[in-house]
């Protein structure tokens, strides 16, 4: 007998063909011999089956000797053997209906697990293979689980159900709720304005929740809540904000914070958490602030950085257009009795300049020790 696979909620068309290319009498029955539908002349007649309101045929095809059974809004329990009686012949078609659903919401937080459950008719032994948007294949039987969802798992999952050498394909859209970046570093000279941005990696029509930014300053012994806020239909409203620093937060997405100036006491790292309505768990993004200061006191020219720098970063002091006078993998460097001219303090990673601060050293005959800063913006 012919096997047809169907998807829960979909429409299936079971074919039945007579040798005569004209409209003749036909009946469709289920395995219990209960009539589903048939014809009486050019009229469609229906029997007392459970499919009554969901069964149909195509009258336009009857004249060609085709008498299909169309079943709409398929249910797992529609799986059965359907018999078409035409011209004293019986054509049997076995319909197997499968359903594949995410057993939780399809909007999941990064790091959570996704479980896909296959609904199948009794007696069937299907196999399932799913391909994630990043090309990862997973196989299973009645259930498939993916732990520790990542941002790249967002998108359409394509799952193939195989039964009796036939296959049916399901597409499930999964949204992984996360920030675009897990971590970011902002490099600033002392006194410069600081902007932190926390773009989300997903878009939803209505976004509601609450969030907080905790800050651990390098100089402080404990972390401090800098700001708490609510999110209602994508509108940000600040609930509580620290007085030092004087933070401002934008009222629309992406989440955005500004500090009027970078100061050594603010250098450190923060953790922004966002709890979304009707979701367990929180979204996290780490943000780091590195602050540079170049100063001249008496005969000592010093450059310092504060904040979370990697040990491989190089801090250098050099006179403009000359070789570096001092270059160390440390957070402070200095030059004694510096020559007059424009000095540059550079924080670099493998030759790439991350942060630069310029300071002018005046000739000592001018009274010595006087100085001023020049800020070059990148």
């Amino acid at each position: 007998k012919k096997v047809v696979l169907g998807k829960k909620g979909d429409t299936v068309e079971l074919t039945c063909t007579a040798s005569q290319k004209k409209s003749i009498q036909f009946h469709w029955k289920n395995s219990n011999q209960i009539k589903i539908l048939g014809n009486q002349g050019s009229f469609l007649t229906k029997g007392p089956s459970k499919l009554n309101d969901r069964a149909d045929s195509r009258r336009s095809l009857w004249d060609q000797g085709n008498f299909p059974l169309i079943i709409k809004n398929l249910k797992i329990e529609d799986s059965d053997t359907y018999i078409c009686e035409v011209e004293d012949q019986k054509e049997e078609v076995q319909l197997l209906v499968f359903g594949l659903t995410a057993n939780s919401d399809t909007h999941l937080l990064q790091g959570q697990s996704l479980t896909l459950t296959l609904e199948s008719p009794p007696g069937s032994s299907p196999s399932v293979q799913c391909r994630s948007p990043r090309g990862k294949n997973i196989q299973g039987g009645k259930t498939l689980s993916v732990s520790q969802l990542e941002l790249q798992d967002s998108g359409t999952w394509t799952c193939t159900v195989l039964q009796n050498q036939k296959k049916v394909e399901f597409k499930i859209d999964i949204v992984v709720l996360a920030f675009q970046k897990a971590s970011s570093i902002v490099y600033k000279k002392e006194g410069e304005q600081v902007e932190f941005s926390f773009p989300l990696a997903f878009t939803v029509e209505k976004l509601t929740g609450s969030g907080e930014l905790w800050w651990q300053a390098e100089r402080a012994s404990s972390s401090k809540s800098w700001i708490t806020f609510d999110l209602k239909n994508k509108e940000v409203s600040v609930k509580r904000v620290t007085q030092d620093p004087k933070l401002q937060m934008g009222k629309k997405l992406p989440l955005h914070l500004t500090l009027p100036q970078a100061l050594p006491q603010y250098a450190g790292s923060g953790n922004l958490t966002l709890a979304l309505e009707a979701k367990t768990g929180k979204l996290h993004q780490e943000v780091n602030l590195v602050v540079m200061r170049a100063t001249q006191l008496q005969k000592n020219l010093t450059c310092e950085v504060w904040g979370p720098t990697s040990p491989k970063l190089m801090l250098s002091l050099k006179l403009e257009n000359k070789e570096a006078k001092v270059s160390k993998r440390e957070k402070a460097v200095w030059v004694l009795n510096p020559e007059a001219g424009m000095w540059q303090c550079l924080l670099s990673d493998s030759g790439q300049v991350l942060l630069e601060s310029n300071i002018k050293v005046l000739p000592t005959w001018g009274g010595g020790g006087s100085h001023h800063h020049h800020h070059h913006h990148h």
């Epitope: 902007e195 209602k232 409203s237 401002q248 009222k251 955005h256 500004t258 009027p260």
Partner: antibody, heavy 119, light 107 residues
Framework: EVELLESGGGLVQPGGSLRLSCAAS????????MSWVRQAPGKGLEWVSG????????YYADSVKGRFTITSDNSKNTLYLQMNSLRAEDTAVYYC????????????WGKGTTVTVSS | AIQMTQSPSSLSASVGDRVTITCRAS??????LGWYQQKPGKAPKVLIY???SLQSGVPSRFSGSRSGTDFTLTISSLQPEDFATYYC?????????FGQGTKLEIK
Amino acid sequence: EVELLESGGGLVQPGGSLRLSCAASGLTFSTFAMSWVRQAPGKGLEWVSGISGSGENTYYADSVKGRFTITSDNSKNTLYLQMNSLRAEDTAVYYCAKEGYNWNYMDVWGKGTTVTVSS
Amino acid sequence: AIQMTQSPSSLSASVGDRVTITCRASHGIRNDLGWYQQKPGKAPKVLIYEASSLQSGVPSRFSGSRSGTDFTLTISSLQPEDFATYYCLQDYTYPYTFGQGTKLEIK
């Protein structure tokens, strides 16, 4: 076409109260944030108060905080500004303005209503 | 509150001139700034939103730009109907704040 029409202005003594209304037509009121902006005679524009589309969040300029209250009635498509403890420096033309989708900018303004606080 | 410093406060120019007005924000405000034109006895009208987007129906001689916390409104070739007062408005966060205004007069 979206239209905003302010009313309720007039002459009031210092310490008195007034309620301004802003009737909106041609829009789904609850979708948009709204603001009140004022302009004292011969002076620049000053933002006074704002309300989110849902009506849940309200905001005020420091100069009016504790004295003015912004509310909206979505069923009447009307924005209100209740002004108490009025001072001479509150004398101004008061405009109501609708914000664009996603709170981008004030894209529609009313013609304004004049409030004079004087004894 | 975020301060908006607008300059110049007044400006004399002739038809056909290129004119620029600037606003500086005391904090970073992304692109969350609009430019508004107001004529005597009338309500303000938006020209530019989100720092550089031209409002529908506004002539293309108006343009806006941003550099950090500095915002500029440029009128490429002044027309007689452009003589008015111009304001910037930050809508980054509440309380919103306007610049002091720039009165553009005929020379």
